[in-house]
């Protein structure tokens, strides 16, 4: 699998993206997890609807929501509040039995605001009693990271 | 009507290649992995590994992995298990089966199997 | 590899019995078990899905139960076209693996 970057502005939200074949994964509920480490686990974030009938309906745990179009075949992850330690490496799984198949592998990569929003003082942030829908979720800029490209290049 | 129709009994030489057929009907062949399970003379059920026609995603169990060969043609829904060089240990039967995803506890099992086909390897 | 347990191996009984199959998983496995039926000379056919779920056209008779490592498969009142191998099979993980079979014998 070749990994996609989701670009994403600090304090903003970021949705990501994981399109599958509908019919191969037909029944199977899905996963968001967390790459620990290069050879680590990936640790569970969120799944959608233990019935897997109901997986549009939209699934939360904290700042992280999930809901898959089971019929178009689109995964969709909403990271709302976005915060430097949310960059990293995640993947999109399709799970069956215990067992968990990649579907995408996602590099998240948090910028920086370019207006410091952290000096005004009228500034709305969502707050936690906010609900995924009212928040506002920015077009992610996205790409696919080429193979032996460094994900974050060593400063000099 | 679901069918999974597999080609005819074998009897070859030990050092022999042989590939043997699978062929769907009554469903979207395209649409449902396709598992290989064996029958050794007398034994149980071994699952040797899966294919999905629509892309070719294969998977195997370690213990037929690099012995035996999985494949698919979706033109025309038949699924492959092939060998490149027999031993007298592949005696068996060989069933293919439809999996299918219950999507009440996101799993699979098997719901539509072929009548099997004797594979005999003797010298 | 998760290694399945049926016990017994084999099982006399006769028509109008009741009789019950177990299936051990060497862990757990939640729900995620099969129950196939197979007659001589023929294919393995589907019974119980999901530990629990009967497969569309399977007599009311059979039954499964269970959850986690130990499994059972019930046939309330055996009929004649019962006597044939039985077989569980795990769905938790690759490989799929399946017990050894029980073969149910008319007394």
């Known amino acids: 699998h070749n990994t996609t970057v989701f670009q994403g502005v600090e304090g903003q939200s970021l949705q990501v993206s994981c399109p599958y074949d509908s019919m191969k994964h037909w029944g199977r509920r899905k996963a968001w997890c967390r790459q620990l480490g290069e050879k680590g686990p990936c640790q569970r974030v969120v799944s959608t609807h233990n019935l897997w009938l109901l997986s549009f309906l939209r699934r939360r745990n904290g700042s992280t929501a999930i809901t898959d179009d089971t019929l178009g075949g689109t995964l969709t992850i909403t990271l709302r509040n976005l915060q430097p330690h949310d960059a990293g490496f995640y993947q999109c799984q399709s799970l069956h039995g215990s067992e968990a198949d990649t579907l995408r592998k996602v590099l998240v990569e948090v910028l920086a605001d370019p207006l410091d929003h952290r000096d005004a003082g009228d500034l709305w942030v969502p707050g936690e009693s906010e609900s995924f829908e009212d928040a506002h979720v920015e077009h992610s800029i996205s790409r696919s990271l080429l193979e032996g490209e460094i994900p974050f290049p060593p400063t000099s | 009507e679901v069918q999974l129709v597999q080609s005819g009994a074998e009897v070859k030489k030990p050092g022999e290649s042989l590939k043997i057929s699978c062929k769907g009907s009554?469903?979207?062949?395209?649409?449902?992995?396709i598992a290989w399970v064996r029958q050794m003379p007398g034994k149980g059920l071994e699952w040797m590994g899966i294919?999905?026609?629509?892309?070719?995603?294969?998977r195997y169990s370690p213990s037929f992995q690099g012995q035996v060969t999985i494949s698919a043609d979706k033109s025309i829904s038949t699924a492959y298990l092939q060998w490149s060089s027999l031993k007298a240990s592949d005696t068996a039967m060989y069933f293919c089966?439809?999996?299918?995803?219950?999507?009440?506890?996101?799993?699979?099992?098997?719901?539509?199997w072929g009548q099997g086909t004797l594979v005999t390897v003797s010298s | 590899d998760i290694q399945m347990t049926q016990s017994p191996s084999s099982v006399s009984a006769s028509v109008g019995d009741r009789v019950t199959i177990t299936c051990r998983a060497s862990?757990?496995?939640?729900?995620?078990l099969a129950w196939y039926q197979q007659k001589p000379g023929k294919a393995p056919k589907l019974l119980i899905y999901?530990?629990?779920s009967l497969q569309n056209g399977v007599p009311s008779r059979f039954s499964g139960s269970g959850s986690g490592t130990d499994f059972t498969l019930t046939i309330s009142s055996l009929q004649p076209e019962d006597f044939a191998t039985y077989f569980c099979?795990?769905?938790?993980?690759?490989?799929?693996?399946f017990g050894q079979g029980t073969k149910l014998e008319i007394k």
């Open positions: 862990q757990g496995i939640s729900s995620w």
């Open positions: 099979q795990q769905a938790d993980s690759f490989p799929r693996t």
């Open positions: 999901a530990a629990s």
């Open positions: 009554g469903y979207s062949f395209t649409s449902y992995w």
């Open positions: 294919i999905y026609p629509g892309d070719s995603d294969t």
């Open positions: 089966a439809r999996q299918r995803t219950f999507y009440y506890d996101s799993s699979d099992y098997f719901d539509y």
